[in-house]
């Protein structure tokens, strides 16, 4: 499973898309400017096993997906962009997916700890509600895509983890 | 919790199609799957498809190759299942089925099927 | 392609027994990607226990899972009158994405 290869690349097209779908300057938007507290430091002392590793990645792609395949964000971006994006995202689901099944022989490794995983879900929680509060102005979305990008370009411990035989 | 209610009974003749309709409703997502699976009487279940709705996206079983066209509206989220040269042995229940988003970790949330239509059967008869 | 074969086909029990459902698949499959479903009788069926041995919300503690590899088990340990059904197990692969049905175990009243 050549997951830290493949992770990467789709991961930085990904980026790319998502710095392309930007329609307004985020110096316009800096009065909606929001602290929605990536859960950074619970994942940056943790050491994560490759199917933990996996399981996260896969919760973040998941919860990012979600966010970007709903009408409101139908109507605030470019489709052939925002189509791009989320056919991106979803080979990336497919990729963790299949490499949990080739960790067949060690997968005695739990997938996750619930804490990681409920920590990523309020993140996308607070950023949802956040939208809502903003009624999806375009500087609303414009804040969370900026956000979203941050959040893609963190996982660093992560994605030593998929590096990691378990 | 996710209702899937799918349309009624029908009876159709060898050689013809049917399409069955699966209206989801309640925190449903266009980004998780939807398939269809059916079951012949007295029989076990058969995974026959899946579409994801965001994307139009579909996997078919390889039995139904050729056979099977299943399509998707994203408002409201409806999945329908097309079948053609119909043949007896596809007399069935056929259930769309779908995933929950409350699978932790969702990993998980895909790779099995949460929620369930209440099935339409179909009945193949000359 | 991966087959599911789960035995006995029929388990003939009177409530308060234990019971263990077996499911073997032709080839390797992660148990994080198994799982079971109870159905009843001119019913849907029901989400049991997925990732191998998690139960779905509302599942009794009588129903646990467990195995790996190619043999895994549905264990219930005390049957009430409402547990007799037939129950499926199931696996997932990917890509493509496959779902794969065993032939089903029915649990009767003796």
């Known amino acids: 499973c050549d997951l830290p290869q493949t992770h990467s690349l789709r991961n930085r097209r990904a980026l790319i898309l998502l710095a392309q779908m930007g329609r307004i300057s985020p110096f316009s938007c800096l009065k909606d400017r929001h602290e929605f507290r990536f859960p950074e430091e619970e994942f940056d002392g943790h050491q994560f096993q490759k199917t933990q590793a996996i399981s996260v990645l896969h919760e973040m792609i998941q919860q990012t997906f979600n966010l970007f395949s709903t009408e409101d964000s139908s109507a605030a971006w470019e489709q052939s962009l925002l189509e791009k994006f989320s056919t991106e995202l979803y080979q990336q689901l497919n990729d963790l997916e299949a490499c949990v099944i080739q960790e067949v022989g060690v997968e005695e490794t739990p997938l996750m700890n619930e804490d990681f995983i409920l920590a990523v879900r309020k993140y996308f929680q607070r950023i949802t509600l956040y939208l809502m509060e903003k009624k999806y102005s375009p500087c609303a979305w414009e804040v969370v895509r900026a956000e979203i990008m941050r959040s893609f370009s963190f996982s660093t411990n992560l994605k030593k983890g998929l590096r990691r035989k378990d | 919790e996710v209702q899937l209610l799918e349309s009624g009974a029908e009876v159709k003749r060898p050689g013809s199609s049917v399409r069955v309709s699966c209206r989801a409703s309640?925190?449903?997502?266009?980004?998780?799957?939807i398939s269809w699976v059916r079951q012949a009487p007295g029989q076990g279940l058969e995974w026959m498809g899946r579409i994801l709705p965001a994307l139009g996206v579909t996997n078919y079983a390889q039995n139904f190759r050729g056979r099977i066209t299943i399509t998707a509206d994203k408002s409201p989220l409806t999945a329908y299942l097309e079948l053609s040269s119909l043949r007896f042995e596809d007399t069935a229940v056929y259930y769309c089925?779908?995933?929950?988003?409350?699978?932790?970790?969702?990993?998980?949330?895909?790779?099995?099927?949460?929620?369930w239509g209440q099935g339409s059967l179909v009945t193949v008869s000359s | 392609e991966i087959v599911l074969t789960q035995s006995p086909g029929t388990l003939s029990l009177s409530p308060g027994e234990g019971a263990t459902l077996s499911c073997r698949a032709s080839q390797n499959v992660s148990r994080h990607y198994l799982t079971w479903y109870q159905q009843k009788p001119g019913q849907s069926p029901r989400l049991l226990i997925y990732?191998?041995?998690s139960r779905a919300t509302g599942v009794p503690d009588r129903f646990s899972g467990g195995g790996s590899g190619t043999d895994f088990t549905l264990t219930i340990s005390r049957l009430e009158p409402e547990d007799f059904a037939v129950f499926y197990c199931?696996?997932?692969?990917?890509?493509?994405?496959?779902?794969?049905f065993g032939q089903g175990t029915k649990v009767e009243i003796k």
């Open positions: 089925a779908s995933p929950s988003a409350d699978i932790i970790p969702s990993i998980l949330g895909t790779t099995l099927f949460a929620f």
């Open positions: 199931q696996s997932y692969h990917s890509p493509p994405p496959v779902y794969t």
């Open positions: 990732g191998g041995s």
């Open positions: 309640g925190d449903t997502f266009s980004s998780y799957p």
